[in-house]
């Protein structure tokens, strides 16, 4: 970067440039310790050394040098629990949202050399250490392998794996994206004796096929088993193998609860409770019934038994079970009772304590706010996050409940730490929460700190983004407000990003940024310097984000309002908000735009086609255009099935194509990556076809070989430059 020319004090601040955003000039850092015990953790330093830290002895040393990392071009690592070996990960090759393949090398810390003989095959789809010792489980070509020690030959646990057909220990596309949100589907028992895994059989699933153009004379065809709404789904089976003598009994199948197995179903998660107790969660295809099943290993039978009296049913009568996903249980030390977040009688998601049956659950938190995540349950404390503090749904604070006390006492750990700077936290706990790290994401500059798990005392600042703070000193940042507006009986929270020299008496163009998907949240108290920050800072555009009905953490009445009728209230509430913003007096009614990506592209498209005349123009990036084109697990969760006797009518009514005529009076920019594995290019192709058939003029841009994120540097630069030109033209802003 060129050195700065000295300028005398005064208002020398400059506006953000698009280049700043595209270069990531103002990106922030977070610090998550890689915990390896109660008081020890690892962290990768700026210069790529892997450093060991002991909080109590204040000892720190390099456990793995950057030269060792560099010798195999490693970008990640994993220490074995016995601390004898480290796996080094290189040749990272992204597949879908979470999945990737890589090459793995095992480094022997004792000998100071790489383990030779029986090297791991490549590329590996997933690899992990056992929780104790140094056993390795890995997935290669859709099959699971086990090594008793890194230098040992591998034992092949599964033989059914087949590309695009049967997946063992890793999810298929739809489970990865819509159910597990992980790249793996295998879990070690706490003592490393058992390994549980899922087999996904996609043999009967229809294939989505699209061209990948590459550089060759002929394009390649990408084929993915992808169940769209109403299509055949993966068949799942859960197995557990004894890793001490895996060859004796082989994988043992875990039975599916009868009430689940009677029709199409999903596996939703697996939690080890103890070395011989496991908890599986299942979900009916119609996702309003979830069953949590606790299974025990019966030594005498050499089988996993899941008694009916250890099945706990969670059912929603107003929508779907859970939030975006069904919550997972946090078991107590007794390995029987557990804490879980689900809706209370008033429809707010709260922590409940389940000892025997769900009916007898004891509600631990309550109020017109929501418990969001249980981080850790220890002997005497439960740590969780919620949006209770001061009634702002878009905040996250960490709370501790002392469960030893009767009644349990509650303390907000984070509420008053750095109140102006920090209102949105997550946390990372050491093994028994003896220590924890807090990571604050905003609204001020992110900061990561280390704390004592008993006193909550701050021990150390791990990362405070000083460099970023310094470089932002000469930047004119916009002002950010989070407020609420009322309409009838409804309350909508919004975030408004106002240009630096904002003057209420003037008129400004307005850009609505929308996502709006079920159980999402856009109005969050987090720090960001991104494209919309630039638009406000440099181009003088007012930006607004509104959380309408269907969004999360404000109770089920608000959340489930969109159940079985997507595309209605999400749009209506954006329109309501725009009208309210106009009433505020500083919005130029002739210059209002809306943009969104993915679900936001769907909502922005429907808003533009609402026929209200509110919007002059808008952008949809990678929009869904019909719920029939999207993944079964997602579409059906919120819409039911696209069948005559279920909800086909609304599936048809809620398409963007059905509203093609209404785009006539707006400027519409439609953008999509041709290699979008998630929201297929088909969605935009169908919108374009409908607009052409209706003889409606529109603008479009495709990004060849780009996926749902349009992430390649060149594409992203082009995308944001293109959208900026479009908006500036729409708002008559000079270039």
């Amino acid at each position: 970067r060129p050195s700065r020319v000295y300028k005398p004090e005064g208002n020398t601040k400059r506006a953000l440039t698009l280049k700043d955003i595209l270069n990531g000039t103002f990106s922030y850092k977070t610090y998550f310790p890689n915990w390896i015990s109660e008081q020890e953790y690892l962290h990768q330093s700026e210069d790529d050394n892997i450093v060991f830290y002991n909080i109590e002895t204040r000892e720190s040393y390099i456990i793995l040098s950057n030269s060792t990392m560099k010798s195999v071009n490693a970008t990640d690592y994993g220490l074995s629990p016995d601390r004898q070996f480290v796996y080094l990960e290189s040749d990272y090759s992204k597949l879908w949202r979470y999945s990737y393949t890589a090459t793995y090398y095992i480094y022997d810390l004792q000998n100071g050399e790489f383990v030779r003989g029986y090297e791991l095959p490549r590329p590996i789809q997933y690899l992990c250490w056992s929780p104790v010792g140094s056993k390795l489980a890995y997935v290669y070509q859709n099959n699971i392998y086990l090594k008793q020690r890194p230098g040992d030959p591998p034992f092949q646990i599964t033989y059914t794996g087949r590309e695009n057909r049967i997946f063992n220990g890793i999810p298929d596309w739809v489970y990865e994206e819509e159910m597990l949100a992980t790249k793996y589907a295998l879990w070690w028992s706490p003592d490393g004796k058992f390994l549980a895994y899922v087999e996904f059989n996609d043999s009967d699933i229809p294939i989505i096929a699209y061209s990948y153009y590459g550089d060759g004379q002929y394009p390649r065809t990408i084929n993915i088993p992808y169940p769209k709404a109403g299509a055949k789904n993966p068949v799942v089976r859960v197995f557990i193998v004894d890793t001490t003598y895996p060859h004796h009994v082989g994988p043992m199948e875990v039975p599916v609860p009868e009430m689940i197995a009677s029709s199409d179903y999903y596996f939703s998660w697996l939690t080890w409770v103890s070395s011989e107790r496991v908890c599986l969660q299942w979900l009916k295809r119609v996702q309003n019934v979830s069953v949590l099943s606790i299974c025990d290993f019966r030594e005498d039978w050499h089988a996993w038994e899941c008694p009916k009296n250890q099945e706990h049913v969670e059912e929603s009568r107003t929508g779907w079970a859970g939030g975006f996903f069904v919550s997972t249980p946090a078991f107590s030390q007794d390995a029987t009772s557990y804490y879980k977040i689900f809706s209370d009688k008033d429809g707010y998601k709260h922590i409940h304590y389940i000892k025997d049956t769900v009916e007898n659950a004891i509600q631990i938190t309550s109020g017109k706010w929501e418990a969001i995540y249980i981080f850790r349950v220890t002997q005497d404390s439960l740590f969780y996050s919620s949006n209770e503090f001061e009634g702002y749904p878009g905040r996250r604070n960490i709370y501790r409940i002392s469960i030893g006390n009767s009644p349990p006492s509650k303390k907000c750990v984070t509420c008053h730490l750095r109140k102006e700077r920090c209102q949105y936290y997550t946390a990372s706990f050491s093994y028994k929460a003896k220590y924890y790290a807090l990571v604050c994401y905003g609204p001020g500059l992110p900061i990561s700190t280390l704390h004592d798990g008993r006193t909550d005392q701050e021990i150390q600042v791990l990362e405070e983004n000083k460099e970023l703070e310094n470089s932002l000193r000469n930047i004119q940042l916009p002002k950010v407000e989070i407020k609420k507006l009322k309409d009838g009986g409804l309350t909508f929270w919004y975030k408004m990003i106002l240009p630096p020299q904002f003057d209420r008496s003037k008129k400004y163009p307005l850009l609505i940024q929308v996502y709006g998907g079920p159980c999402s949240q856009s109005v969050k108290s987090v720090f960001a310097v991104n494209w919309i920050t630039y638009l406000a800072s440099k181009e003088g555009i007012v930006i607004a984000l509104v959380d309408g009905r269907g969004t999360a953490f404000q109770g089920d009445k608000f959340l489930h309002a969109v159940y079985r009728k997507l595309g209605v209230y999400e749009v209506e509430d954006q329109l309501t908000a725009v009208r309210k913003f106009i009433e505020m007096g500083f919005i130029d009614e002739e210059r209002i735009a809306i943009w969104g990506w993915s679900y936001g592209g769907y909502v922005s498209s429907l808003a533009l086609a609402s026929g209200t005349g509110l919007f002059k123009c808008g952008i949809a990036v990678a929009p869904v255009s019909s719920w029939e084109y999207y993944a079964s697990i997602y579409s059906e969760r919120f819409m039911g099935l696209p069948t005559k006797d279920d909800n086909l009518e609304h599936y048809k009514n809620s398409t963007v194509m059905a509203r093609a005529e209404y785009f006539r009076n707006v400027d519409y920019l439609l953008i999509h990556g041709t290699a979008d594995d998630n929201v297929h290019f088909q969605n935009s192709a169908q919108i374009a076809k409908a607009l052409v058939n209706a003889q409606v003029d529109f603008q479009a841009m495709w990004y060849s070989d780009q996926n749902h994120g349009i992430l390649s540097g060149r594409s992203q630069n082009h995308l944001y430059t293109h959208m900026t030109h479009f908006l500036k033209q729409c708002f008559s802003l000079s270039d």
Epitope: G117, Y118, K147, Q148, R149, D152, P153, F155, Q156, Y159, T160, R237, T244, Y245, P246, H247, H248, V249, G250, P251, M252, E253, R298, D300, W301, H302, A303
Partner: antibody, heavy 117, light 108 residues
């Protein structure tokens, strides 16, 4: 007490078929993978085939692949081996054994299959 | 497939003597996957040792197993009259599971 009892052996012509059964008792049959191991007269032991506890996965030695089919009926606690296109080299005592790829902790007494014209 | 080679083919010993049987694998076998069996004429094999060194239920402690990688040993510390039989090693690491050709322990 664990017991495995094979039956169905006998004399068969080359190209013929035979179905062996193994009745199991004394343990939770459906929880265990089961195998067939054979022993040609005066020779060593050869693993032939295995099946998972649920019956969903089957495994074969190359020498019998495509000709032999292993199956089980967990409701009857019985293991089967359907042998088609039999050859002289399939002549052996066939044992059913408890386990997948070993260790085979329990064995039946064996049933003799003779393939001869 | 993994080939197991047992030696010697025959071992002639007297009761009370120590017997040492060897099993060599064509490629490394983690000790977890190696077992030893005893077979007497007209009888089914009987599991003696699993995991290279763990005795199966009811097996007298004169039988012991050791080894790792490619070399494994079955030791009978003091031969009893009922110990004269054929002994097989077996690996369960790979499909197909394979057995050694056997070592016959006969009375000298």
């Amino acid at each position: 007490e664990v017991q495995l009892l094979e039956s169905g052996g006998g004399l068969v012509q080359p190209g013929g078929s035979l179905r062996l059964s193994c009745a199991a008792s004394g343990f939770t049959f459906s929880s265990y993978a089961m195998s067939w191991v054979r022993q040609a007269p005066g020779k060593g032991l050869e693993w032939v085939s295995a099946i998972s506890g649920s019956g969903g996965s089957t495994y074969y030695a190359d020498s019998v692949k495509g000709r032999f089919t292993i199956s089980r009926d967990n409701s009857k606690n019985t293991l089967y081996l359907q042998m088609n296109s039999l050859r002289a080299e399939d002549t052996a005592v066939y044992y059913c054994a408890k386990g997948w790829l070993g260790p085979f902790d329990y064995w039946g007494q064996g049933t003799l299959v003779t393939v001869s014209s | 497939e993994i080939v197991l080679t047992q030696s010697p083919g025959t071992l002639s010993l007297s009761p009370g003597e120590r017997a040492t049987l060897s099993c060599r694998a064509s490629q490394s076998v983690s000790s977890s996957y190696l077992a030893w069996y005893q077979q007497k004429p007209g009888q089914a094999p009987r599991l003696l040792i699993y995991g290279a060194s763990s005795r199966a239920t009811g097996i007298p402690d004169r039988f012991s197993g050791s080894g790792s990688g490619t070399d494994f040993t079955l030791t009978i510390s003091r031969l009893e009259p009922e110990d004269f039989a054929v002994y097989y090693c077996q690996q369960g690491l790979n499909i197909p599971s394979t057995f050694g050709q056997g070592t016959k322990v006969e009375i000298k």
